[in-house]
């Protein structure tokens, strides 16, 4: 059986697959997924290994019409480095010489300058090029190689291994060499895989059942450390509770060097955030941190300094801490907008069972603002999801030059932010460089400000506008309001009407349904339309909603289904990657972010059309 990294190299024109008959004969044969000799896999960014021989595809020289055969894998050899060129060409790195079928006289696969159909290769059974099943480095744990990546294949006691092995062990622990010759270099580490006993790599907090892995012997960059955690279905450490910090202080007390945690300010337009999307509500900075030096965007925990945090350049090589298991956040159910009939007094705006109101003109210090909201039967607003934030920005009349109190503060416990309405902190969205909590002036209260409505801590004594929120009162059956310019069941935002398509559909079916409604799959022109759509679909139970974006027409170039330029994107992490497909908006913790899906997957969708009676603005000229 093929493992997920293995593939057959298929030429569509001949309908045959590459077959490693012997190390010196790499030919083609009728495709057979059970034949070891036809299985290949990437073993580095640029090397392809024959699974049968544990040798790599290579050439004797970078010249036209030489045979491609198998060689001992050597990551330094220029003659074994392959890259995908446009679409389905596979070429030797840095040259216009391609992996070619050969011809009637030449049965062997050849290196050839021609880029026709005989030089075009796909993964058998798919429409994808060979790079779509690319190599993912596997970072090791423990061992003696400072967390270096596995080198496949590697030699141990004169035998070659293309996967992690328990050779030499009686306990089943899986390991790999981190250079191709363990026998000479003696460098190895344990694999970040599940095997009997691998749970002893983790420390479980008996109070919360959350597990932590301290990799103090590793030396990785922040991004590599994060990848290593993710390979174990974990994330770099987030700390949201004081108890959690205390537990980790104990766990790391015997260590001296810094360890990467998930805190970072890598997002271009927002502030400090945890990589696992936990709220940044507890602060434990080392005095003098975070320093404002550019590039110091990643954070380490300092065992030698009472486990306090320090921001460093992300390329520094350190140990790291992974975290997995139940999140330390209290479970807090946010009702879906559609579940709650929301009735609000005049001048209050409804959303998901609550009513909201901006007080912009009567500026008040935080304490007085809170008193006013409570007198009105509510509280300073708490914000629990990106959808709720985006509702406030897109539908409450929030303005880019606003600076408004919200309910978040650390008045009760310094450096531990809480909502004034007592609801748990499940979400934060800080402005770049925030929370700064400047020591020379107490910044215990929080404002929303700037075009995105992101947050900053502020001295509580400033007179500012504020946002109140209260529970809505349910009264009788809900009246469906027909919005002016939109048909019944459609929701208006600015010049457009939007509708959720409730039948699970492929991208093509969704597009057709919208067209039948004299509409189209939604485009997203800017941050504000994105905010509206996030609040529109983000709290729904379904995972995805189709938008009109895809690269169906030209692979790698994403276009809307209608003739409109792509001027704004909101990709999820690791997107769009190399995957061709159609774009859907996520809901839940990644609410509103865009993922590339296979176009024949079924999802709900959002249709859009011009509202009636709206004058179309002129098309922007470039």
């Amino acid at each position: 059986l093929l493992d997920t990294r293995q593939f057959l190299i298929y030429n569509e024109d001949h309908k045959r697959c590459v077959d490693a008959v012997s190390p010196s004969a790499v030919q083609t044969a009728a495709c057979n997924q059970d034949a070891e000799s036809q299985k290949f896999r990437w073993v580095s960014e640029s090397q392809i290994m024959s699974v049968a021989f544990k040798l790599c595809l290579g050439v004797p020289s970078k010249t036209d019409w030489v045979a491609i055969t198998l060689y001992a894998c050597d990551s330094k050899s220029e003659f074994q480095k392959w890259e995908c060129k446009n679409d389905t060409l596979l070429g030797i790195k840095g040259e216009d010489l391609f992996f070619n079928y050969g011809n009637r006289q030449e049965k062997n696969i050849m290196l050839y300058k021609g880029s026709g159909l005989w030089s075009r290769w796909k993964i058998y059974g798919t429409t994808d090029n060979l790079c779509s099943r690319g190599y993912e480095a596997m970072y090791t744990l423990l061992g003696n190689a400072n967390g270096a990546t596995c080198a496949f294949p590697f030699k141990f006691e004169n035998k070659w291994y293309a996967d992690c092995t328990s050779a030499g062990r009686s306990d089943g622990w899986l390991w790999c060499g981190t250079t191709t010759d363990y026998d000479t270099d003696k460098l190895f580490g344990y694999c970040p895989l599940k095997f009997e006993g691998s749970e002893s790599l983790w420390n479980k907090d008996p109070l919360t059942s959350v597990s932590y892995q301290i990799n103090s012997k590793s030396a990785l960059t922040w991004h590599q450390a994060r990848k290593s955690c993710q390979q174990q279905n974990a994330e770099l450490l987030s700390i949201t509770e004081i108890h959690e910090q205390t537990y980790l202080t104990g766990l790391t007390s015997s260590l001296t060097s810094g360890l990467w945690i998930g805190l970072n300010s890598l997002s271009f337009n927002s502030g400090w955030q945890w990589s696992d999307r936990s709220p940044f509500r507890y602060l434990n900075w080392l005095p003098g941190s975070p320093s404002a030096e550019p590039g110091k965007s990643c954070v380490s925990l300092n065992p030698g300094k009472n486990a306090k945090w320090e921001n460093l350049e992300c390329v520094q090589k350190l140990g790291y801490i992974c975290k997995k298991g139940n999140t330390t956040l209290n479970s807090f159910v946010i009702p879906s907008e559609s579940d709650v009939p929301t009735h609000c007094p005049s001048q209050w705006w409804p959303y998901a069972g609550h009513c909201y109101k901006i007080h912009r003109d009567e500026k008040k210090i935080q304490r007085d603002a809170l008193t006013t909201c409570r007198k009105e039967g509510g509280d300073l607003t708490s914000i629990h999801t990106i959808e709720e934030l985006d509702f406030i920005i897109s539908q409450l009349g929030y303005e880019p030059n606003d600076e408004l109190w919200i309910g978040l503060n650390d008045i009760k416990i310094q450096m531990y932010f809480e909502w004034s309405d007592g609801t748990p902190v499940t979400f934060t969205k800080w402005l770049r460089g925030e929370p700064s909590h400047e020591n020379n002036r107490q910044e215990d209260c929080v404002v929303m400000k700037g075009k995105d409505g992101y947050w900053a801590d502020r001295g509580c004594e400033w007179p500012l506008g504020y946002i109140c929120k209260m529970k809505s009162r349910s009264q009788g059956p809900e009246i469906v309001e027909v919005e002016k310019g939109c048909r019944k069941g459609w929701k208006k935002h600015h010049f457009y009407c939007y509708m959720i398509g409730h039948t699970l559909s492929t991208f093509a079916e969704a597009n057709q349904t919208c067209n039948n409604e004299n509409a189209y799959l939604t485009t997203i022109e800017d941050r504000y339309e994105q905010a509206f759509l996030t609040s529109f679909v983000g709290l729904r139970p379904e995972k995805y909603f189709w938008t009109g974006l895809s690269d169906i027409q030209t692979k790698g170039t994403f276009q809307w289904t209608i003739e409109e330029e792509v001027r704004f994107t909101h990709w999820n992490s690791d997107m769009p990657g190399r995957k061709p497909g159609c774009v859907a908006m996520r809901t839940g913790i990644a609410g509103g972010l865009w993922d590339v899906l296979k176009c024949d997957e079924k999802a709900k969708f959002v249709c859009k059309h011009w509202a009636e009676g709206v004058t179309h603005p002129p098309k922007p000229t470039t």
């Epitope: 030499g168 009686s170 306990d171 006993g197 002893s200």
Partner: nanobody, 110 residues
Amino acid sequence: QLVESGGSLRLSCAASGSIFTINAMGWYRQAPGKQREEVAAITSGGSTNYADSVKGRFTISRDNAKNTVYLQMNSLKPEDTAVYYCKAVVVTTTPYSDYWGQGTLVTVSS
């Protein structure tokens, strides 16, 4: 070590060096002219296993904090005469897991 038949003896074995964790520890013995055989083993979780010939007479235990394993031998018989070896299955800075002690001779006289 010389002990009379019916007597008792306690063996101990400590693992040291750059050890991350010890997954199992055990005692083996080799009588003159015979194959080495497992006497008793204990996992990191404390599960134990005994050879039929010693069940009810020998007890294996371990002190995780000290990386030490013990073998309490009661009601000894002349056929228990052998060189006793301890083995630790460890996670350390080489990929090999099995580390052996140098062995101690136990002679049970009749």
